[in-house]
Interface confidence: medium
């Protein structure tokens, strides 16, 4: 049975600033044919037929649901892209994470401007902070890492706060063991 294709993002963030670039790639098993990919944005078929969809100079209307399909194989699960205009944007490698998987958070400044005195918060409580901008990495996410995250920082001497982001860590499905 052919596997569903999967949409991946490069860079891996599904929340980006207006004007930034992101590449969506449709990955799957044994898809060798060029120009055999269908891309859907908010349900509408895109003109792009390559396995990669480049979003250059992102606009607000690029926000929404993206799915891909290779020939007659099932559509991929949707990926949601959000385009923002703000001083700070909290980005996550995934908003729904399987327990045991890594989770990366990034406090991203508008136009890649330097952000310093960065503090990450979870459920209103300060997590780690740095004077330069660092990412937070959780190597093995647990259910306790679920929560509402945001970051604060200084851009051009002024203090800003990102919009909150909900992160959900779900339990990995139990393996089924059969008696031999």
């Amino acid at each position: 049975v052919p596997q569903k294709p999967k949409v991946s993002l490069n860079p891996p963030w599904n929340r980006i600033f207006k004007g930034e670039n992101v590449t969506l790639t449709c990955n799957g098993n044994n898809f060798f044919e060029v120009s055999s990919t269908k891309w859907f944005h908010n349900g509408s078929l895109s003109e792009e037929t390559n396995s990669s969809l480049n979003i250059v100079n992102a606009k607000f209307e690029d926000s929404g649901e993206y799915k891909c399909q290779h020939q007659q194989v099932n559509e991929s699960e949707p990926v949601y892209l959000e385009v923002f205009s703000d001083w700070l944007l909290l980005q996550a490698s995934a908003e729904v994470v399987m327990e045991g998987q890594p989770l990366f958070l990034r406090c991203h400044g508008w136009r890649n401007w330097d952000v310093y005195k960065v503090i990450y918060y979870k459920d209103g409580e300060a997590l780690k902070y740095w004077y330069e901008n660092h990412n937070i990495s959780i190597t093995n996410a647990t259910v306790e890492d679920s929560g509402t995250y945001y970051c604060t920082g200084k851009v051009w001497q002024l203090d800003y706060e990102s919009e909150p982001l909900n992160i959900t860590v779900i339990k990995a499905p139990r393996e089924k063991y059969w008696l031999q």
Epitope: L127, K128, Y131, E132
Partner: antibody, heavy 119, light 110 residues
Framework: EVQLVQSGAEVKKPGESLKISCKGS????????IGWVRQMPGKGLEWMGI????????TYSPSFQGQVTISADKSISTAYLQWSSLKASDTAMYYC????????????WGQGTMVTVSS | QSALTQPASMSGFPGQSITISCTGT?????????VSWYQQQPAKAPKLLIY???KRPSGVSSRFSGSKSGSTASLTISGLQTEDEADYYC??????????FGTGTKVTVL
């Protein structure tokens, strides 16, 4: 009251090991970096290194890298500074200090631990 | 990294003003708005006087003020009083969670 309480004065011989402590209270110890500062007799303050007790992330001054080890035990809200082999030149007052992210400074200081290394 | 440069000593009469300089580099003082100043009385732990170049914590006298121009920070003590006799140290964030202190200035009230 937010405070850092350091262990008492120590007199050691060259070559001996030592671990001094700094216990935090009155705040969430795991959420603020703790720095260590040396002051040799009659001299100025020297920044040695810093630790984030929440995950033991540590940074050292190049002058002290490999000379000392900074660690923390978050279960008892205590940071440590240790030497594996003391030298006479380690004779100094050692302070721990709490970093404050909202002021970018060391806002709370321990009372200091005097370490004397002499044969 | 090298210590920030401060004058070894300064003195003034009660009521006068003195300004202590603290010279660093573009990598520390010049790169961050994170210069702090500490007062150390004899046989005491340092006490925070100024943070973020020019801000004063609550409880610190308004006679103490900080400023910065380029890679040089300054601490001004106005209306000098006998209790201001102490050692003063600047400190700057120097990147990647490192700090550097100044060489220290001994202030004498004549």
């Amino acid at each position: 009251e937010v405070q850092l309480v350091q262990s008492g004065a120590e007199v050691k011989k060259p070559g001996e090991s030592l671990k001094i402590s700094c216990k935090g209270s009155g705040y969430t110890f795991t959420k603020y970096w703790i720095g260590w500062v040396r002051q040799m007799p009659g001299k100025g303050l020297e920044w040695m290194g810093i630790i984030y007790p929440g995950d033991s992330d540590t940074t050292y001054s190049p002058s002290f890298q490999g000379q000392v080890t900074i660690s923390a035990d978050k279960s008892i809200s205590t940071a440590y500074l240790q030497w594996s082999s003391l030298k006479a030149s380690d004779t100094a007052m050692y302070y721990c200090a709490k970093d404050n992210p909202f002021t970018g400074s060391f806002d709370i200081w321990g009372q200091g631990t005097m370490v004397t290394v002499s044969s | 990294q090298s210590a920030l440069t401060q004058p070894a000593s300064m003195s003034g009469f009660p009521g006068q003003s003195i300004t202590i300089s603290c010279t660093g580099t573009r990598d520390d003082v010049g790169n961050y708005d994170l210069v702090s100043w500490y007062q150390q009385q004899p046989a005491k732990a340092p006490k925070l006087l100024i943070y973020e170049d020019n801000k004063r914590p609550s409880g610190v006298s308004s006679r103490f003020s900080g400023s910065k121009s380029g890679s040089t920070a300054s601490l001004t003590i106005s209306g000098l009083q006998t209790e201001d006799e102490a050692d003063y140290y600047c400190c700057s964030y120097a990147g990647d969670y490192t700090y550097v202190f100044g060489t220290g200035t001994k202030v004498t009230v004549l």
